[in-house]
């Protein structure tokens, strides 16, 4: 029974997007009154795991020594205090990469773009997939865009961006996936360096913020119109 206790905070280290075989630690932080922590995984019997709190009792560690498909999914945690169980944490989406072969990422018409113009990043897979994702390295939200064709199997996805500004310059990678599990991604594509040159007009000095300003993706070339799950996944359903 969820009580009036404040919800805990749930996060993953080193992050929520983990390569196959790598280790990951899930942390749940509650209050100093916590006596026990529980981790639930969506579509798995509850509780998925229980842990005693680490001193000073305000958090617990759930360890995954080697990432596999079984661990990918959506998690929530709770803590128990003398007055009962807390509300659930916001969800954590743990994503595994390396489930499929890597796609190819290219830029049309060219990876060299003039500010104020457009570019389309094209992610192509060898086998048909129904979901493609584009990420920008060192962006505030590492997974910027998720695209689904409502089950239609495609060999490629186009990510249009316009107007491009200096903020869009940087390194991009893409992933592909199947709709039945958005938590299992391909190996990442080789990196694509997008270079924004010149300007149609002198822009003001760029701020330090990343492209993840949405997409779609919203965008902000990739600005999503959907929600931003706790993992930092930004989903944009086309």
């Amino acid at each position: 029974q969820a009580g009036p206790l404040p919800k805990p905070t749930l996060w993953a280290e080193p992050g929520s997007v983990i390569s196959w075989g790598n280790s990951v630690t899930i942390w749940c932080q509650g209050t100093l009154e916590a006596r026990e922590y529980r981790l639930d995984k969506e579509e798995s019997p509850a509780p998925w795991d229980r842990q005693n709190p680490l001193e000073p009792k305000n958090k617990a560690r759930f360890s995954i020594p080697s990432m596999t498909e079984d661990y990918a999914g959506r998690y929530r945690c709770y803590y128990r205090s003398p007055v009962g169980w807390s509300q659930p944490s916001d969800p954590l989406e743990l994503v595994m990469t390396g489930a499929y072969s890597k796609p190819t990422l290219s830029a049309l018409p060219s990876p060299l773009v003039t500010s104020g113009k457009s570019v389309t990043l094209l992610c192509q897979s060898r086998s048909p997939m129904d979901t493609f994702l584009l990420i920008k390295e060192r962006a505030a939200h590492p997974l910027l865009h998720l695209r689904s064709e409502h089950g239609a199997q495609q060999h490629q996805a186009e990510f249009p961006m316009s107007p491009v500004t200096s903020v869009h310059g940087g390194t991009y990678r893409c992933f592909s996936s199947h709709g039945f599990s958005h938590y299992l991604l391909s190996h990442p594509s080789d990196p694509l360096e997008l270079i924004v040159s010149g300007s149609l007009e002198d822009p003001r000095p760029s701020p330090t913020r990343s492209v993840s300003t949405a997409a779609g993706p919203e965008d902000q070339p990739l600005m999503p119109t959907g929600s931003v799950p706790h993992s930092g996944l930004r989903r944009h359903w086309e």
Epitope: L108, K117, G216, Q220, P221
Partner: antibody
Framework: EVQLVESGGGLVKPGGSLKLSCAAS????????MHWVRQAPEKGLEWVAY????????YYADTVKGRFTISRDNAKNTLFLQMTSLRSEDTAMYYC???????????WGQGTSVTVSS | DVQMTQTTSSLSASLGDRVTISCRAS??????LNWYQQKPDGTVTLLIY???RLHSGVPSRFSGSGSGTDYSLTISNLDQEDIATYFC?????????FGGGTKLEIK
């Protein structure tokens, strides 16, 4: 629900100034680039200005460059268009619109009317 | 600047008809072509972006196609509420430019 509400339009003499505002709600304003678009009476749509989400980049149509200034206050979820040295050809309905980052304007306000006449 | 041309300024059709509105760009715009609907009260709505992608909430009777310089908007089963003016717009390079509009009327 995304909502954009323009205000500040009115009647102004040639050479005069006017400041339009656009109040945004229903989305994280600071995440999106914004546009001003205008439509003269019985005419088509004309793009006026664009401001990137963090105000880092701004573009203007040649017809307004040097006279109009687009700005935004992300803390107040508001977009502005400062118009100076107004001419009769600036008479139009002015719309603010949200940039979708893919070359389109995905949500528009209802517009505010500006009339420049002596 | 990229010039956008909608050769048909007005179009008359019957309810239930399949209607196609064309738009031509003065240069290749790499599919960065969008369609908007403006109702008689002035309300503007995005229908299609990036040539063929349907904006959320737009009925599936609207579709878009094209490439290079030639693009079109198709309304497959004309409804009374589709009476409006339709504008194309290129988002390939600033300044963004619009076509002159096509006013759709009922026969």
């Amino acid at each position: 629900e995304v909502q954009l509400v323009e205000s500040g339009g009115g009647l102004v003499k040639p050479g005069g100034s006017l400041k339009l505002s656009c109040a945004a709600s229903g989305f994280t304003f600071s995440d999106y680039g914004m546009h001003w678009v205008r439509q003269a009476p019985e005419k088509g749509l004309e793009w006026v200005a664009y401001i990137f989400s963090g105000s880092s980049t701004i573009y203007y149509a040649d017809t307004v460059k040097g006279r109009f200034t687009i700005s935004r206050d992300n803390a107040k979820n508001t977009l502005f268009l400062q118009m100076t040295s107004l001419r009769s050809e600036d008479t139009a309905m002015y719309y603010c619109a949200r940039a979708d980052g893919r070359g389109a304007m995905d949500y528009w306000g209802q517009g505010t009317s500006v009339t420049v006449s002596s | 600047d990229v010039q956008m041309t909608q050769t048909t300024s007005s179009l008359s059709a019957s309810l239930g008809d399949r209607v196609t509105i064309s738009c031509r760009a003065s240069q290749d715009i790499s599919k960065f072509l969008n369609w908007y609907q403006q109702k008689p009260d002035g309300t503007v709505t995005l229908l299609i972006y990036y040539t063929s992608r349907l904006h959320s909430g737009v009925p599936s009777r609207f579709s878009g196609s094209g490439s290079g310089t030639d693009y079109s908007l198709t309304i497959s089963n004309l409804d009374q509420e589709d009476i409006a003016t339709y504008f194309c717009q290129q988002g390939n390079t600033l300044p963004w430019t619009f076509g002159g509009g096509t006013k759709l009327e009922i026969k």
